[in-house]
C-alpha cells in the first residue's frame, strides 16, 4: 500500500537567463528511495539520481543542469523554451513509484518574481 505523498515547489516563475531550483519531497512513507528521475515537459529525461551510484546528467543538459540541493535539480541559464511542466519520479521500495509535477514559467521581465511555495499536487 502506497502511503507516501510528494510535495513539490508547485507553480514557479523565474527570470530568463537566471536559474531556478526544482524540488520534490517524499513524505509519510518509510519506503527506501532507490532512484529519482527528473523529466521535462516533452518527456525527455534531464537527470537521474541513483541511490547507489549518484547523479547522471543527460548530455544535452550537462551545461545547464546542476544536481541538488538534495534530490532536487537546479536549472540554469533559463530560456523561454524552458517554460512548461517538470516531473519528479521517485522509485521506491517497497512502495513503488511516486510522481510529482512542477510548472515553471520563464518570464522576460527583469522583475520576474521567483515563487517557491511547497504544495501537494
Amino acid at each position: 500500500m502506497m502511503t507516501g505523498t510528494i510535495e513539490t515547489t508547485g507553480n514557479i516563475s523565474a527570470k530568463k537567463g537566471g536559474s531556478v531550483i526544482l524540488q520534490c519531497h517524499l513524505s509519510s512513507t518509510m519506503a527506501q528511495v532507490t532512484q529519482v528521475n527528473w523529466e521535462q515537459h516533452d518527456h525527455s529525461l534531464l537527470a537521474i539520481r541513483n541511490a547507489e551510484l549518484g547523479w547522471h546528467i543527460y548530455p544535452a543538459f550537462k551545461d545547464r543542469v546542476a544536481p541538488g540541493p538534495g534530490l532536487g535539480l537546479t536549472l540554469q541559464s533559463l530560456t523561454m523554451n524552458d517554460t512548461g511542466e517538470y516531473f519528479c519520479t521517485y522509485h521506491t521500495y517497497p512502495d513503488g513509484t511516486y510522481r510529482g509535477r512542477i510548472f515553471l514559467e520563464v518570464l522576460e521581465s527583469s522583475v520576474a518574481e521567483h515563487s517557491a511555495r511547497f504544495q501537494i499536487p
Epitope: Q35, L45, I48, N50, E52, L53, G54, W55, H56, I57
Partner: antibody, heavy 128, light 107 residues
Framework: EVQLVESGGGLVQPGGSLRLSCAAS????????MDWVRQAPGKGLEWVGR??????????EYAASVKGRFTISRDDSKNSLYLQMNSLKTEDTAVYYC???????????????????WGQGTTVTVSS | EIVLTQSPGTLSLSPGERATLSCRAS???????LAWYQQKPGQAPRLLIY???SRATGIPDRFSGSGSGTDFTLTISRLEPEDFAVYYC????????FGGGTKVEIK
C-alpha cells in the same frame, strides 16, 4: 586514442607509503567516474575504490580492506587520478590498475556501470 | 556485500567447442550492473559484456551474456585460440565486487 597510464609503483616496507598516478588521455576526464582495481600475484581482481565525477562532487568510495589507509583523489585540470597508500601491509602487494568507470543511462531509466578502459597496471610490492 | 561465485574454477576445452561460464550472486543484482571481463596473462582486464547481455565495442559476436537476478552466464559459442584466458564477472554493489574468475584452458 583513449588511454590510461599508471605510474608510481615500487618496493616499499610494511607501514610505508606510496602514491600511484594514472594519466588519462583521449576523453573528457571530468565527466567520468574513475576506479582503482588491484590484483595480488596469482589471485583475482579486487576493487579498491572510486572517485565520482564533477557532477557528483568528486565523492569517493573504498573497499573495506583499504578504508582509512588509502585515499583516492583526482585533478581534472591535469587529467590525472591518484591513489595515496599509507600504512601499507604485505597483503597490499599487487598490480594496481586504474580504470574508467562508465556510468550512464540510456533513453530509458535503466542505468549501467562498467569499466571500459583500463591502464596497463603498476606493481606495488610491500616487503621488508 | 554481494558475493559473486564463478563456476567452474577451470574449464578445459578444445578450440571450436562451446564454453559456458556461470556467475552466481549471493543476492539479487540489477542486470544492468553486471559485467564480464577477459584477462590474459600479463595483461590488463578487457571489458567483454556490460548490462549482463550487451557486447562491448569490438567484441566478436561469439561472446554472449545472459541471466538476471542471481544467475548470470557468459557463453563463448566457438572457442578461438585467443579466447583461452581468465574470465571475471563484476557487479556494482556497493561495494563493487568481482567473482573469483574462471580459467578457460586448452584441453
Amino acid at each position: 586514442e583513449v588511454q590510461l597510464v599508471e605510474s608510481g609503483g615500487g618496493l616499499v616496507q610494511p607501514g610505508g607509503s606510496l602514491r600511484l598516478s594514472c594519466a588519462a588521455s583521449g576523453f573528457t576526464f571530468s565527466d567520468h567516474y574513475m576506479d582503482w582495481v588491484r590484483q595480488a600475484p596469482g589471485k583475482g581482481l579486487e576493487w579498491v575504490g572510486r572517485t565520482r565525477n564533477k557532477a557528483n562532487s568528486y565523492t569517493t568510495e573504498y573497499a573495506a580492506s583499504v578504508k582509512g589507509r588509502f585515499t583516492i583523489s583526482r585533478d581534472d585540470s591535469k587529467n590525472s587520478l591518484y591513489l595515496q597508500m599509507n600504512s601499507l601491509k604485505t597483503e597490499d602487494t599487487a598490480v594496481y590498475y586504474c580504470a574508467r568507470g562508465q556510468y550512464y543511462y540510456g533513453s530509458s531509466s535503466r542505468g549501467y556501470y562498467y569499466m571500459d578502459v583500463w591502464g596497463q597496471g603498476t606493481t606495488v610490492t610491500v616487503s621488508s | 556485500e554481494i558475493v559473486l561465485t564463478q563456476s567452474p574454477g577451470t574449464l578445459s576445452l578444445s578450440p571450436g567447442e562451446r564454453a559456458t561460464l556461470s556467475c552466481r550472486a549471493s543476492q539479487s543484482v540489477r542486470s544492468s550492473y553486471l559485467a564480464w571481463y577477459q584477462q590474459k596473462p600479463g595483461q590488463a582486464p578487457r571489458l567483454l559484456i556490460y548490462g549482463a547481455s550487451s557486447r562491448a565495442t569490438g567484441i566478436p559476436d561469439r561472446f554472449s551474456g545472459s541471466g538476471s537476478g542471481t544467475d548470470f552466464t557468459l557463453t563463448i559459442s566457438r572457442l578461438e585460440p585467443e579466447d583461452f584466458a581468465v574470465y571475471y564477472c563484476q557487479q556494482v554493489g556497493p561495494p563493487l565486487t568481482f567473482g573469483g574468475g574462471t580459467k578457460v584452458e586448452i584441453k
